[in-house]
Amino acid sequence: HTAAQDNCTCPTNKMTVCSPDGPGGRCQCRALGSGVAVDCSTLTSECLLLKARMSAPKNARTLVRPNEHALVDNDGLYDPDCDPEGRFKARQCNQTSVCWCVNSVGVRRTDKGDLSLRCDELVRTHHILIDLRHRPTAGAFNHSDLDAELRRLFRERYRLHPKFVAAVHYEQPTIQIELRQNTSQKAAGDVDIGDAAYYFERDVKGESLFQGRGGLDLRVRGEPLQVERTLIYYLDEIPPKFSMKRLT
């Protein structure tokens, strides 16, 4: 997109600073907080978005754990270290030299340690379960209509390839969206399921990350789908390593 077309802004990330510095005056943008150049034709990585969010007012988010291997973001917001591609660095540390290992969506997957803690690799989150409860409606939504609408949303709004939306389950008032994406399945240019889930989470909270777009207006056959609460569960390709003390 060019500066003339949209006054040099990033359609997919409003937490950016943009300049018409590209070839032919094309708009180029950097994420706030990190100064990393971002591709505005696709979603910005969650790490860069969290980094940008930390340079703005904070709203902690807290999730719950459904089983022994599923991870949730119980630690709230933190100022993450991202690599130049915007991925979370495997090891994260705070300003008091407390360190921990994270998965590809930035959720802690080990006990906290000190600067000697080693995180050999960034473990991929390959399965995400988005658990929603919708507000009461006159009747239940038609399951296949709901399924089609949510798949369309992830395809069109978040640019997630349909093959990564594994299933949509519905038992009124609970909706579950399963996203699956193994390392071997993710090709260059594919949106990451973690990023799609983060954008969706912010959308349903009324905190859209898209530039100048209205908030999320989900409708199933014309009937508004209003989300009351959202829980997101993360499953990694390698199970997390917490001490037994934490699990008791």
Epitope: C8, V17, S19, P20, D21, Q28, R30, V36, P84
Partner: antibody
């Protein structure tokens, strides 16, 4: 054609404040498409980006970690200029200081100011 | 920070020679690279941006190529006014960083 004209003292004492100004002609410091930088060059460090300021509905600043605790870049819309303050300075801050416009490419530069830090 | 390593540091060449300067980044930076020319006592001058786009007003004998971690600046036929020091700069991530420079001297 954008032109950047630098001004400021060439000699600063250790522990004092280095202050330089970059006057802009042919563009506006509060332009919503421009980014304004300070860079320095010394034999020991080579070319070193120090930081930038820009306006996008509000002012944004970013600084290099190496100078973050000591640097301030301030725009002055009334005079269409921006300034650099580095405090306190040491002899290691001796360098030629440049202002420049751009973010993904620095297409206009000031003439450079040699600043010597010495007592 | 991303480190940029230029080679060679010094280069002796004659007018009319084809000259190639290499810049290697410590991490992938896609095409977020610029090249500058600097003459003694002067500010750097932008030659190439986005790895291969020629800045307006710069002679076409200058060209840039590369992506990821390896980039080259080529001067197809060296002219007397091209004897100077050349710098690469990565613009992928703050802090923006520069290479150590390549001084092109007259043989």
């Amino acid at each position: 054609q954008v032109q950047l004209q630098q001004s400021g003292p060439g000699l600063v004492k250790p522990s004092q404040t280095l202050s330089l100004t970059c006057a802009i002609s042919g563009d506006s410091v509060s332009s919503t498409s421009a980014v304004w930088n300070w860079i320095r060059q010394s034999p020991s460090r080579g070319l070193e980006w120090l930081g930038r300021t820009c306006y996008r509905s509000k002012w944004y600043n970013d600084y290099a970690v190496s100078v973050k605790s000591r640097i301030t870049i301030t725009p002055d819309t009334s005079k269409n200029q921006f300034s650099l303050r580095l405090n306190p300075v040491t002899p290691e801050d001796t360098a030629v200081y440049y202002c420049a416009r751009g973010d993904f490419r620095f297409d206009s530069w000031g003439q450079g100011t040699l600043v010597t830090v010495s007592s | 920070d991303i480190q940029l390593t230029q080679s060679p540091s010094f280069l002796s060449a004659s007018v009319g020679d084809r000259v190639t300067i290499t810049c290697r980044a410590s991490q992938g930076i896609s095409s977020y690279l610029a090249w500058y020319q600097q003459k003694p006592g002067k500010a750097p001058k932008l030659l190439i941006y986005a790895a291969s786009t020629l800045q307006s007003g710069v002679p076409s004998r200058f060209s840039g190529s590369g992506s990821g971690t390896e980039f080259t600046l080529t001067i197809s036929s060296l002219q007397p006014e091209d004897f100077a020091t050349y710098y690469c700069q990565q613009v992928k991530i703050y802090p923006l960083t520069f290479g150590g420079g390549t001084k092109v001297e007259i043989k």
